[in-house]
Interface confidence: medium
């Protein structure tokens, strides 16, 4: 069976941007090889956060994770299973 | 196919606790029929992350966001769907 | 592989229009006060950011989802 | 429901020593800024719960996972 | 400081449309909430819905769908109301109130005067 | 629509006295409420938001508490600058709802 695979890189950087954490971001930039142009655009992203103070954050933030751990997320490691397991069907 | 449920009110509280908002806290709680000591258990735990100040917020957030999207998580909902899926071929 | 939901929103919220970003958020969290942030931040992102910015958001994010920590 | 890697980690926050929990937490997130932040955590609550504190905190959790909510 | 304010009163007769006035000041226009309410002699608040000044996006109680037309001018930091085709109903003290942005909770934190609407031939 | 049921509609307190206004939900509104003092001729003030939390420069003998849907507004040792309409109102779900207000009169 192949596993869902959730992209914890994508996490670091939107938790970094979401909380302001200027350091987290540049972190978790480097990690994926981001050009000066590409860091700039997404401190511009993490201004945003700042400006807005905790409540931003915090909402933001819960959202996210309502999106992550919906039914809409869930269900399509579901889905990539069931898709598999009709190839493996098939191809008997 | 059973799509996975992820337990939403789980999160609410989670975030809550985890963001030191205690009105969000005492909002979840209601949800779940919470007795005044539950709720002051809660409370000791979220003043934990609140003297522990936003690092605490953001490095547990993460954490959290990054097991729920984690193999593991994802993959429990794959299982359940091979399970179905074995129980509805050998029903046949 | 990241979640397509989840890809969809930060797509939104750099590429879409305010509504189209609200009211995808609203599928998931309906609250007002939710909802109504959720405009202040997609509007501050769109003054803030050039049309060469977004590119360059996007840039980053497509080399989030091709890396091997992805 | 509740995914059981989730559960897990929650259970160990409260009923965990604090090795078992940094051990779990290191098993998703393994940076030492994490790590740390996660005995800190734990050994907050550790000193601030009493052994009823606890129970009701995982009273709390069994009506969150019995919740039509979940 | 913040400042939000209305003319004290407003004559229209029944069926002549009118727009009322809220001018804000002492904080940036575009970045807050501006929601307005109702309240007639003797009774409670009321509603009435909100805008958003940065995008023009408003939020109305259905209630006041189709009586009221919230707009705002960014140029002079003023938001407005337009009532339709207005009736005695209508006479009432309207509110602008602008919405607090601290905090994970929503409240009104700064009030204009309130304008006294009259209907009245 | 969610309605916000206040009572009782007025009631005449002597100064020093101790106050307790109500207002219930018709169905979960969370910590979403709000209370608002309101003096004759003038535009109503936030007193207490989220339930429970006093607004900036409001005196602590104003408290707000909430069990379930049931909201209250305490006024310990009441002053006679205290005299005026108390609205509560809700910000859990569109559209925003208030209650039909208690008014606090002197005896």
């Known amino acids: 069976v192949k596993m869902a695979e959730t992209c914890p890189i994508f996490y670091d950087v939107f938790f970094a941007v979401a909380n302001g954490n200027e350091l987290l971001l540049d972190l978790s930039l480097t990690k994926v090889n981001a050009t000066e142009p590409e860091r700039t655009a997404m401190k511009k992203i993490q201004d945003c956060y700042v400006e807005n103070g905790l409540i931003s954050r915090v909402l933001d933030g819960l959202v996210m994770t309502t999106i992550s751990s919906s039914k809409d997320c869930m269900g399509e490691a579901v889905q990539n299973t069931v898709e598999d397991l009709k190839l493996n069907t098939l191809g008997r | 196919v059973k799509m996975a449920e992820t337990c939403p009110i789980f999160y609410d509280v989670f975030f809550a606790v985890a963001n030191g908002n205690e009105l969000l806290l005492d909002l979840s709680l209601t949800k779940v029929n919470a007795t005044e000591p539950e709720r002051t258990a809660m409370k000791k735990i979220q003043d934990c992350y609140v003297e522990n100040g936003l690092i605490s917020r953001v490095l547990d957030g993460l954490v959290m966001t990054t097991i729920s999207s984690s193999k593991d998580c994802m993959g429990e909902a794959v299982q359940n769907t091979v399970e179905d899926l074995k129980l509805n071929t050998l029903g046949r | 592989e990241i979640c397509p939901a989840v890809k969809r929103d930060v797509d939104l919220f750099l590429t879409g229009t305010p509504d189209e970003y609200v009211e995808q958020v609203a599928q998931y969290k309906a609250l007002p006060v939710v909802l109504e942030n959720a405009r202040i931040l997609k509007n501050c992102v769109d003054a803030k950011m050039t049309e060469e910015d977004k590119e360059n958001a996007l840039s980053v994010l497509d080399k989030i989802y091709t890396s091997p920590l992805c | 429901e509740i995914c059981p890697a989730v559960k897990r980690d929650v259970d160990l926050f409260l009923t965990g020593t604090p090795d078992e929990y940094v051990e779990q937490v290191a098993q998703y997130k393994a940076l030492p800024v994490v790590l740390e932040n996660a005995r800190i955590l734990k050994n907050c609550v550790d000193a601030k719960m009493t052994e009823e504190d606890k129970e009701n905190a995982l009273s709390v959790l069994d009506k969150i996972y019995t919740s039509p909510l979940c | 400081q913040v400042q939000l304010q209305q003319p004290g009163t407003e004559l229209v007769r029944p069926g002549a449309s009118v727009k009322l006035s809220c001018k804000a000041s002492?904080?940036?226009?575009?970045?807050?909430?501006i929601n307005w309410v109702k309240q007639r002699p003797g009774q409670g608040l009321e509603w009435i819905g909100n805008?958003?000044?940065?995008?023009?996006?408003?939020n109305y109680n259905q209630k006041f769908k189709d009586k009221a037309t919230l707009t705002v001018d960014k140029s002079s930091s003023t938001a407005y109301m337009q009532l339709s085709s207005p009736t005695s109903d209508d006479s009432a003290v309207y509110y602008c109130?602008?919405?607090?942005?601290?905090?994970?909770?929503?409240?009104?934190?700064?009030w204009g005067q309130g304008t006294t609407l009259t209907v009245s031939s | 629509n969610i309605v916000m049921t206040q009572s009782p509609k007025s009631m005449s307190m002597s100064v020093g006295e101790r106050v307790t206004l109500s207002c219930k939900a018709s169905?979960?509104?969370?910590?979403?409420v709000f209370w608002y003092q309101q003096k004759p001729d003038q535009s109503p003030k936030l007193l207490i938001y989220?339930?429970?939390n006093r607004y900036t420069g409001v005196p602590d003998r104003f408290t707000g508490s909430r069990s379930a849907t049931d909201f209250t507004l305490t006024i310990s040792n009441v002053q006679a600058e205290d005299l005026a309409d108390y609205h509560c109102?809700?910000?859990?779900?569109?559209?925003?709802?208030f209650g039909a207000g208690t008014k606090l009169e002197l005896k």
């Open positions: 109130t602008r919405r607090g942005n601290y905090g994970n909770l929503y409240y009104f934190d700064y």
């Open positions: 109102g809700q910000s859990y779900s569109y559209p925003l709802t």
């Open positions: 805008i958003y000044p940065s995008d023009s996006y408003t």
């Open positions: 989220g339930a429970s």
């Open positions: 169905e979960n509104v969370g910590s979403y």
């Open positions: 002492g904080y940036t226009f575009t970045s807050y909430w």
